[in-house]
Interface confidence: low
């Protein structure tokens, strides 16, 4: 019997939404604890099994009804008929005139219905249940408090959109207010609460109350079925009514992809697009940079075919024989870079002398990639995987305030390179094959040295005038440099062994470099050039009008260090005070850096020529480094 009573009470309580729709028994007990005394008799001070009010409800603020449990009639004790009496407060004081229920039928068994004639919305009521003249339960309320609208009707939904991934979709849920709610006249102002969940879930997701009869529901999972329900309450008073009938929402799969979890798909998407993008970029790279790819994979470095020197001597590392051959000048100096252990090299592929089949070495050199990343330390060379070729040291002397561009150091301006002149806007022999014929490529940063060297090192030279200018000199016409060939041409070799070099080719415009612009005093770059392929540093240069032919006198040094060998030929210089050196010779061709220093580093295959400085009136000198082509080397030796 007790179990039956418990189930009955729970059923009644569950059907009641007077308690704000809370589906937890604990919440119901707290909200209307008097309605469930039989469930937990300990909650009630007098816990005898007597009739109890379960709820009173007004669906539309015009009528209301009250319900109770008739427990006593199902027990052994019969207390007689149950009656409901009510009283209303017309003034501040309650009247003690109790009137019996006007309608025991209309609202069903164990209920009392108050139609509009008996309902005063603003006046509080007290009701009581009696049996055999004794009060068994008593409640007080205001009609406005017990408003519980009927459930919303006509629920439906429409698809708003589907996410780009096809995983989620947004829908719009619509409904209508209950028929008996006087919405139009404003007698009732309803707020709605929508709840939804996946069919297999137990917990409903509750949306914030709204005043409209439609609401978007976002981010529902596609290919899942959802249940949606709506309930309503009188705004600012009353309790939520019962929920509407459940609306089932099934979102069909709208993507060819199906995945268990959301986070799988984006990765798949990223991988697909990533692979596609890489493929496209690879093809673009292959087709647009064929020359540079060849340079990167098989760097074409000139074979040291020097007439008069057996290549086997170079291959076998017999440097002393090479020294003997080259040591034909009297101004040899026994200085040596024994402490420059950081000078690095590029291996020459001596075994393939016929590699140069399609284009000259100069072409290959000039088509090297100038767009490698800039770095202050250890920039990797495209040829050998080591840091780039020769790295002429920078003297710290002869710095003038005027020499330093805008007062900033080279290293501090890594971003100044973009859009400014590059000294090595090289004259590409095949302009059609190069995408760089219009603009100067980006240059490397200055002072490309190893980590243990944090400042420039002096270059052992004959005089103090062999100073690299470390300053930045702004180019007046950066674009005019784009067609300059910086390779000195070997025009003759004297019987005494002196090499006669002629200046490099003029630019395409047919002007000498100094004639390109009237006000253009110098050719320079913002930072020392560090070309990944062949050139590592090109300090600030100046246009120096000199005689077109310059005589080279070689000075040979013996090998003192097998680890780090320099076969140095002395710089081709004219005396600093030589008359006419600083004069401008109209129509004279612009001299280029002359390659007069041979470096053989760590192996007989490393053959590098350094450029040396030309004397300037103001003691500023040109300096560069790079390779001499085999064609030019062939002319050096008889």
């Amino acid at each position: 019997m007790d179990l039956w009573q418990l189930l009955l009470t729970l059923a009644l309580a569950g059907s009641s939404d007077a308690f704000s729709g809370s589906e937890a028994t604990a919440a119901i007990l707290s909200r209307a604890p008097w309605s469930l005394q039989s469930v937990n008799p300990g909650l009630k001070t007098n816990s005898s099994k007597e009739p109890k009010f379960t709820k009173c409800r007004s669906p539309e603020r015009e009528t209301f009804s009250c319900h109770w449990t008739d427990e006593v009639h199902h027990g052994t004790k019969n207390l007689g008929p149950i009656q409901l009496f009510y009283t209303r407060r017309n003034t501040q004081e309650w009247t003690q005139e109790w009137k019996e229920c006007p309608d025991y039928v209309s609202a069903g068994e164990n209920s009392c219905y108050f139609n509009s004639s008996f309902t005063s919305i603003w006046i509080p009521y007290c009701i009581k249940l009696t049996s055999n003249g004794g009060t068994v339960d008593e409640k007080c309320f205001s009609v406005d408090e017990i408003v519980q609208p009927d459930p919303p009707i006509a629920l439906n939904w429409t698809l708003l959109n589907v996410s780009l991934t096809g995983i989620h979709a947004d829908i719009q849920v619509r409904w209508e207010a209950p028929r008996n709610a006087d919405i139009q006249k404003g007698w009732m102002v309803l707020e709605y609460e929508l709840q939804y969940k996946e069919v297999n879930e137990t917990k409903w997701k509750m949306m914030d109350p709204i005043l409209t009869t439609s609401v978007p529901v976002y981010s529902l999972k596609v290919d899942k079925e959802y249940e949606v329900r709506v309930r309503s309450k009188q705004r600012n008073s009353g309790n939520y009514g019962e929920f509407s009938e459940v609306l089932y929402v099934t979102l069909p799969q709208m993507s060819q992809f199906t995945c268990e979890e959301d986070f799988y798909f984006p990765w798949l998407l990223i991988i697909i697009f990533g692979i596609f993008g890489l493929t496209v970029m690879l093809f673009v790279f292959l087709f647009s940079k064929q020359q540079r790819i060849k340079m990167l994979i098989l760097p074409p470095v000139p074979v040291p075919k020097i007439k008069g020197i057996d290549p086997d001597l170079l291959k076998e590392g017999k440097l002393e024989e090479v020294n003997t051959i080259l040591a034909i000048h009297d101004s040899y100096k026994p200085e040596f870079h024994s402490d420059d252990s950081w000078v690095e090299f590029i291996e020459l592929d001596i075994d393939e002398p016929d590699e140069k089949t399609e284009e000259s070495d100069t072409d290959r050199l000039l088509s090297s990639d100038h767009e490698k990343s800039h770095s202050n330390l250890g920039v990797k060379d495209g040829d050998s995987g080591r840091t780039s070729c020769c790295e002429p040291d920078i003297l710290e002397t002869d710095f003038n305030a005027n020499d330093i561009h805008e007062g900033t150091s080279e290293v501090a301006q890594p971003q100044r390179l973009k859009g400014e002149a590059d000294l090595l806007c090289l004259d590409q022999k095949n302009q059609n094959n190069s995408p760089y014929h219009d603009a100067c490529p980006a240059t490397q940063q200055p002072s490309v040295i190893q980590a243990e060297k944090n400042k420039p090192q002096p270059l052992p030279t004959e005089g103090a005038e062999s100073t690299h200018q470390a300053a930045h000199i702004q180019l007046s016409n950066p674009s005019s440099l784009s067609n300059i060939d910086f390779y000195a041409q070997v025009s003759d070799i004297t019987p005494a062994g002196s090499v006669v070099l002629s200046p490099g080719q003029k630019n395409k415009a047919g002007m000498s470099q100094c004639d390109m612009h009237p006000e253009m005093v110098s050719l320079c770059q913002e930072n020392f050039l560090m070309d990944n392929a062949y050139f590592c540093e090109a300090d600030a240069k100046k246009c120096i009008p000199v005689a077109p032919h310059i005589k080279v006198e070689s000075h040979i040094q013996p090998s003192l260090n097998q680890e780090d060998i320099y076969i140095t030929t002395e710089s081709l210089t004219t005396a600093a005070g030589r008359p006419g050196t600083g004069e401008h010779v109209p129509g004279s061709e612009m001299p280029v850096p002359d390659y007069t220093s041979i470096h053989i580093v760590q192996s007989p295959q490393g053959l590098i020529l350094n450029a040396t400085a030309l004397p300037l009136p103001d003691k500023e000198f040109l300096s560069s480094c790079g390779y001499v082509s085999t064609d030019q080397l062939n002319k050096i030796m008889p």
Epitope: S20, K55, K139, N236
Partner: antibody, heavy 124, light 108 residues
Framework: EVQLVESGGGLVQPGGSLRLSCAAS????????IHWVRQAPGKGLEWVAS????????SYADSVKGRFTISADTSKNTAYLQMNSLRAEDTAVYYC?????????????????WGQGTLVTVSS | DIQMTQSPSSLSASVGDRVTITCRAS??????VAWYQQKPGKAPKLLIY???SLYSGVPSRFSGSRSGTDFTLTISSLQPEDFATYYC??????????FGQGTKVEIK
């Protein structure tokens, strides 16, 4: 005018008992809910107990359950809080308050009228 | 039991400022939330009930709102008499009533 006047507070030793009274005027306790709320010195509000005298329903905070008893005498329009086994942590100002609106509503726990409070000090 | 976490615990504001105090319920309490104002040595006063309903006699600069389990009390333009401690309260759940820790609004 609605008024609530508490009495019965004072100093008591731990383990002792006190009975607080709340005399109501301007409204009928029979048709209202009465709550006891306390506030320890320098602390926040803490609900203690409630009674809905027309149904006899009572409810207590966990911290006082089994030690405190709330009741009402409708003939005297007065509510009571019997406090037994008092502890030092029960030291507080005890307020008697009336629940706003009555049953059936969200508002049955909202308190619209408060008494001036009575201090209960539990100390040895 | 439903817990009410109130923030901030204190705030400094000037007259005319807009002040917002938030209470977060540990579980859904529908709209069964009230807000009170208490001045030192005085009993609390009801400001808001049912989360957003203004109690009679309370100035309209006070307002309440609800967003899920977050409840907010807003004072649109702080007045000198508004410097006090404010409490939120829920009255739904197995422990019928619980209060927030309180927010003290002080003069900046």
């Amino acid at each position: 005018e609605v008024q609530l006047v508490e009495s019965g507070g004072g100093l008591v030793q731990p383990g002792g008992s006190l009975r607080l009274s709340c005399a109501a005027s301007g409204f009928n306790v029979s048709y209202s809910s009465i709550h006891w709320v306390r506030q320890a010195p320098g602390k926040g509000l803490e609900w203690v107990a409630s009674i809905y005298s027309y149904s006899g329903y009572t409810s207590y905070a966990d911290s006082v359950k089994g030690r405190f008893t709330i009741s009402a005498d409708t003939s005297k329009n007065t509510a009571y809080l019997q406090m037994n086994s008092l502890r030092a942590e029960d030291t507080a100002v005890y307020y008697c308050a009336r629940g706003y609106m009555y049953w059936w509503s969200y508002y049955n726990g909202a308190i619209d009228y408060w008494g001036q409070g009575t201090l209960v000090t539990v100390s040895s | 039991d439903i817990q009410m976490t109130q923030s901030p615990s204190s705030l400094s504001a000037s007259v005319g400022d807009r002040v917002t105090i938030t209470c977060r319920a540990s579980q859904s309490v529908s709209s069964a939330v009230a807000w009170y104002q208490q001045k030192p040595g005085k009993a609390p006063k009801l400001l808001i009930y049912s989360a957003s309903s203004l109690y009679s006699g309370v100035p309209s600069r006070f307002s309440g709102s609800r967003s899920g389990t977050d409840f907010t009390l807003t004072i649109s333009s702080l007045q000198p008499e508004d410097f006090a401690t404010y409490y939120c309260q829920q009255y739904e759940g197995s422990s019928l009533i619980t209060f927030g820790q309180g927010t003290k609004v002080e003069i900046k």
